[in-house]
């Protein structure tokens, strides 16, 4: 697994540089978990055709991942802060449980998918110091949760293997927009 | 697996308060989600509030600005500060804890009894 941000050997040769903001540090971690999706991703690929398959709309009925829309706030068109880091957080909290699906769904990246989970974790926190309103924050419902996932996991093979690329593809596509708009805070 | 244990209930006058414990004792206290729920007489058990692993807190509609959930991770508790208490709030109360985010409330307590008289 990747080192985490802050941890490899240039912060450790240059402790004269400035400690990160706020803003950076969130920046770094984004693109760590984007490097362990990455690898995830290569993984998932390797062992089945289905980044190149045309089924995945079938699949993608049945998951209801979080995605950016126009009312989120964190387009250009429309920007507003407080909306949208509402809808990261929210989006982020959501994807906690197809992260727990993960965990069981790789051989020679298991560490990985958990660096990324917990990496996950650690975005959260530093993303709730910057909000405002954590009170227009819905976090999901352990039993609707519990019920997903086990839905998740009686499915066949095929369905499973399509359901870990698309909660990848997906969970890659909602950072890259957090990462956009976080950068225009 | 985590034991929990609810204290704090009692008989209380409407609009009065009372503070709801729940201890946790077991395996490392860090659970995904902790739950407040309650079950009124001759009723079905009903949501009443969760605070998630960061501390973000969500309430039912019936308990909103008069209920708060907070945490002390250090002697591994969970409250339930209740005000302006009504008749309707009357219920055994219980906390649940879910371990992992998929896992569901897979830890109960066994309740503790709030009446509120008018």
């Known amino acids: 697994a990747p080192v985490p941000p802050g941890e490899d050997s240039k912060d450790v040769a240059a402790p004269h540089r400035q400690p990160l903001t706020s803003s950076e540090r969130i920046d770094k971690q984004i693109r760590y978990i984007l490097d362990g999706i990455s690898a995830l991703r290569k993984e998932t690929c390797n062992k089945s055709n289905m980044c190149e398959s045309s089924k995945e709309a079938l699949a993608e009925n049945n998951l209801n991942l979080p995605k950016m829309a126009e009312k989120d706030g964190c387009f250009q068109s429309g920007f507003n802060e407080e909306t949208c880091l509402v809808k990261i957080i929210t989006g982020l909290l959501e994807f906690e449980v197809y992260l727990e699906y993960l965990q069981n769904r790789f051989e020679s990246s298991e560490e990985q998918a958990r660096a990324v989970q917990m990496s996950t974790k650690v975005l959260i926190q530093f993303l709730q110091k910057k909000a405002k309103n954590l009170d227009a924050i819905t976090t999901p419902d352990p039993t609707t949760n519990a019920s997903l996932l086990t839905k998740l996991q009686a499915q066949n093979q095929w369905l499973q293997d399509m359901t870990t690329h698309l909660i990848l593809r997906s969970f890659k596509e909602f950072l890259q927009s957090s990462l956009r708009a976080l950068r225009q805070m | 697996q985590v034991q929990l244990v609810e204290s704090g209930g009692g008989l209380v006058q409407a609009g009065g308060s009372l503070r709801l414990s729940c201890a946790a004792s077991?395996?490392?206290?860090?659970?995904?989600?902790m739950g407040w729920f309650r079950q009124p007489p001759g009723k079905v058990r009903e949501f009443v509030g969760r605070?998630?692993?960061?501390?973000?807190?969500n309430y039912a509609d019936s308990v909103k600005g008069r209920f708060t959930i907070s945490r002390d991770n250090n002697n591994n508790t969970v409250y339930l500060q209740m005000n302006r208490l009504k008749p309707e709030d009357t219920a055994v109360y219980y906390c649940?804890?879910?371990?992992?985010?998929?896992?569901?409330?897979?830890?109960w307590g066994q309740g503790t009894q709030v009446t509120v008289s008018s």
């Open positions: 649940a804890a879910a371990s992992r985010s998929g896992s569901g409330y897979d830890s």
């Open positions: 077991g395996r490392t206290f860090s659970p995904y989600t």
């Open positions: 605070i998630n692993w960061s501390g973000i807190r």
